[in-house]
Interface confidence: low
């Protein structure tokens, strides 16, 4: 539908509050280092301009594209070159190159200070003094640290953030009310950011076809009663939404997401029986709820897949006529029958099926050639099943912290060139798969575990892409989206790695460790563990365990000492010497 003014169209569709919030998110995700006040000023200028276009769509510049308007506005920032360096060169380009250039400069690991949570009373005072600024600051701080955060979902988080403060700042015990809610929002926010990052990586690195295949599989699992045509329509619309958000088109994305939620709710009878509750909620909650809705029950009388995809004499004819549609139907039919499989496994099966048809439909006897294609699926299914079984057993035996440590050692030996903070962050997240998924029954373990691991390994891939140091990581990250996890699983100890020089400073600790939270103390210990493995990649589990046990005892002892700093200095030297001896350093 044609609109004289795109900016007026989106302002009217979204309303002023959402329009301003989304423009702030967009600007903060592009210019991640800019001060809050500068962004607020830019957003206010854009909003005032949008209002003039709403009043008169023919007014000057109202016909310009959003990329042109927003890019022009970002390029007015005076300190662009000194703050962002070569990103300023983007401003010399025309659209769409300029926007592509801004996108390429988004930084997954910006050099920003850690967000420190103030005292509850301080936060409540700030909330009451100026609620609007307080909430804008939340959007700004999250968006600049997570430049691919799914913008309409961030509006939902902000709504919950506001609700938490509204409720808890008038509670008798403000802290008891507020802190658990903020912890939950923080953890959910990190997970949401990582999930969206994978969607954007999928679109940007592997293209629309890869994303659509993922969406066909996931939506077919979720809506197994929906017809293929219905699933295809949802996939096309969902792809458009995510392409827009990943491309920085946040107003279009939020608008189209709202339209998609509306469509799903208007057609829920032909989509899923599980949508009723979601569809009774307000817009932001509705969209979130639909995205998280449980899988509908599978239709009872689904016929065997073999009839249409192996036994039929028309397999090659159907495949040749419309390859992507036929493969899409295969994926849909397989996925709706297998809510117990991970999406990445379903995509591996579809890829195997495609490869087989490519080969066999050119053969003398195609049917004879592809007759056993389903037998090729067995090892592909068993590999993740066995891996999850082994790792859940290890998790149940060790508990989360020690399971994370086992993964830290495993991954540091595989890719020792990767930076220590990245190895710690990624291995800690990999280790969380245990508490997240091992509690589930067999039928839910694989989709939980393997699809979660895809999200975490994507974090490794995007962090590594910024400063590539390991050919093995690059290879696993770029060769195949669906085979990333098997690729990393298959890596053995890197025999080419030259151990890091021993540096006593790395293993020198101070009394400040005693005041850290349990989580931060764990990170300190895990950082030391990674460094140990980098110094001594051939160290055995037993050797590393002995050193780590000594280290834990040393921290505990010195944190109880009267003169903590002296204890850390003297006992630390002894610990380093003992560790060197134990590891033969």
């Amino acid at each position: 539908d044609a609109h004289k003014s795109e900016v007026a169209h989106r302002f009217k569709d979204l309303g002023e509050e959402n329009f301003k919030a989304l423009v702030l998110i967009a600007f903060a995700q592009y210019l991640q280092q800019c001060p809050f006040e500068d962004h607020v000023k830019l957003v206010n200028e854009v909003t005032e301009f949008a209002k003039t276009c709403v009043a008169d769509e023919s007014a000057e510049n109202c016909d310009k594209s959003l990329h042109t308007l927003f890019g022009d506005k970002l390029c007015t920032v005076a300190t662009l070159r000194e703050t962002y360096g070569e990103m300023a060169d983007c401003c010399a380009k025309q659209e769409p190159e300029r926007n592509e250039c801004f996108l390429q400069h988004k930084d997954d690991n910006p050099n920003l200070p850690r967000l420190v949570r103030p005292e509850v009373d301080v936060m409540c005072t700030a909330f009451h003094d100026n609620e609007e600024t307080f909430l804008k600051k939340y959007l700004y701080e999250i968006a600049r640290r997570h430049p691919y955060f799914y913008a309409p979902e961030l509006l939902f988080f902000a709504k919950r953030y506001k609700a938490a403060f509204t409720e808890c700042c008038q509670a008798a015990d403000k802290a008891a009310c507020l802190l658990p809610k903020l912890d939950e929002l923080r953890d959910e926010g990190k997970a949401s950011s990582a999930k969206q990052r994978l969607k954007c990586a999928s679109l940007q690195k592997f293209g629309e076809r890869a994303f659509k295949a993922w969406a066909v599989a996931r939506l077919s699992q979720r809506f197994p009663k929906a017809e293929f045509a219905e699933v295809s329509k949802l996939v096309t619309d969902l792809t458009k939404v995510h392409t827009e958000c990943c491309h920085g088109d946040l107003l279009e994305c939020a608008d189209d997401r709202a339209d998609l939620a509306k469509y799903i709710c208007e057609n829920q009878d032909s989509i899923s029986s599980k949508l009723k509750e979601c569809c009774e909620k307000p817009l932001l909650e509705k969209s979130h709820c639909i995205a998280e809705v449980e899988n509908d029950e599978m239709p009872a009388d689904l016929p065997s897949l073999a009839a249409d995809f192996v036994e039929s004499k028309d397999v090659c004819k159907n495949y040749a006529e419309a390859k992507d549609v036929f493969l899409g139907m295969f994926l849909y039919e397989y996925a709706r029958r297998h809510p117990d499989y991970s999406v990445v496994l379903l995509l591996r099966l579809a890829k195997t099926y495609e490869t087989t048809l490519e080969k066999c439909c050119a053969a003398a006897d195609p049917h004879e050639c592809y007759a056993k294609v389903f037998d090729e699926f067995k090892p592909l299914v068993e590999e993740p099943q066995n891996l999850i079984k082994q790792n859940c057993e290890l998790f149940e035996q060790l508990g989360e912290y020690k399971f994370q440590n086992a993964l830290l050692v495993r991954y540091t030996k595989k890719v020792p060139q990767v930076s220590t903070p990245t190895l710690v962050e990624v291995s800690r997240n990999l280790g969380k798969v245990g508490s997240k998924c091992c509690k589930h029954p067999e039928a839910k373990r694989m989709p939980c575990a393997e699809d979660y691991l895809s999200v975490v390994l994507n974090q490794l891939c995007v962090l590594h892409e910024k400063t590539p140091v390991s050919d093995r990581v690059t290879k696993c990250c770029t060769e195949s989206l669906v085979n990333r996890r098997p690729c990393f699983s298959a890596l053995e100890v890197d025999e080419t790695y030259v151990p890091k020089e021993f540096n006593a400073e790395t293993f020198t600790f101070h009394a400040d460790i005693c005041t850290l939270s349990e989580k931060e103390r764990q990170i300190k210990k895990q950082t030391a563990l990674v460094e140990l493995v980098k110094h001594k990649p051939k160290a055995t589990k037993e050797q590393l365990k002995a050193v780590m046990d000594d280290f834990a005892a040393f921290v505990e002892k010195c944190c109880k000492a009267d003169d903590k700093e002296t204890c850390f200095a003297e006992e630390g030297k002894k610990l380093v010497a003992a560790s060197q001896a134990a590891l033969g350093l």
């Epitope: 659209e95 769409p96 629309e208 659509k212 458009k240 088109d249």
Partner: nanobody, 115 residues
Framework: EVQLVESGGGLVQPGGSLRLSCAAS????????MSWVRQAPGKGPEWVSA????????RYAESVKGRFTISRDNAKKTLYLQMNSLKPEDTAVYYC????????GSQGTQVTVSS
């Protein structure tokens, strides 16, 4: 850098035909859906048609359905728009874009339908 260069526009009588081309460079053309967008004088951009990365899935605005056909040749990194039964209201500058965005940045190609 991303470049999209349209060609094939011109002056044509009502009922006539034109074939527009869009040559792409600087990105993995075969991995992205593409669209045609047009902008008539004094109006905002209007989405015309889209095609998915493989060329299997095509979509059209109601105003052009049955008259326009979108296609692509991934080997040649080129997008096409075959326009038949042209009407005066099809007069506009036509742009190709990545994805289904109506944002435009290339020069476009002018199509004028007039007797």
């Amino acid at each position: 850098e991303v470049q999209l260069v349209e060609s094939g526009g011109g002056l044509v009588q009502p009922g006539g035909s034109l074939r527009l081309s869009c040559a792409a460079s600087g990105f993995t053309f075969g991995s992205f859906g593409m669209s045609w967008v047009r902008q008539a004088p004094g109006k905002g951009p209007e989405w015309v048609s889209a095609i998915d990365s493989g060329g299997a899935d095509t979509r059209y605005a109601e105003s052009v359905k049955g008259r326009f056909t979108i296609s692509r040749d991934n080997a040649k990194k080129t997008l096409y728009l075959q326009m038949n039964s042209l009407k005066p209201e099809d007069t506009a500058v036509y742009y190709c874009t990545i994805g289904q965005s109506t944002s435009r940045g290339s020069q476009g190609t002018q199509v004028t339908v007039s007797s």
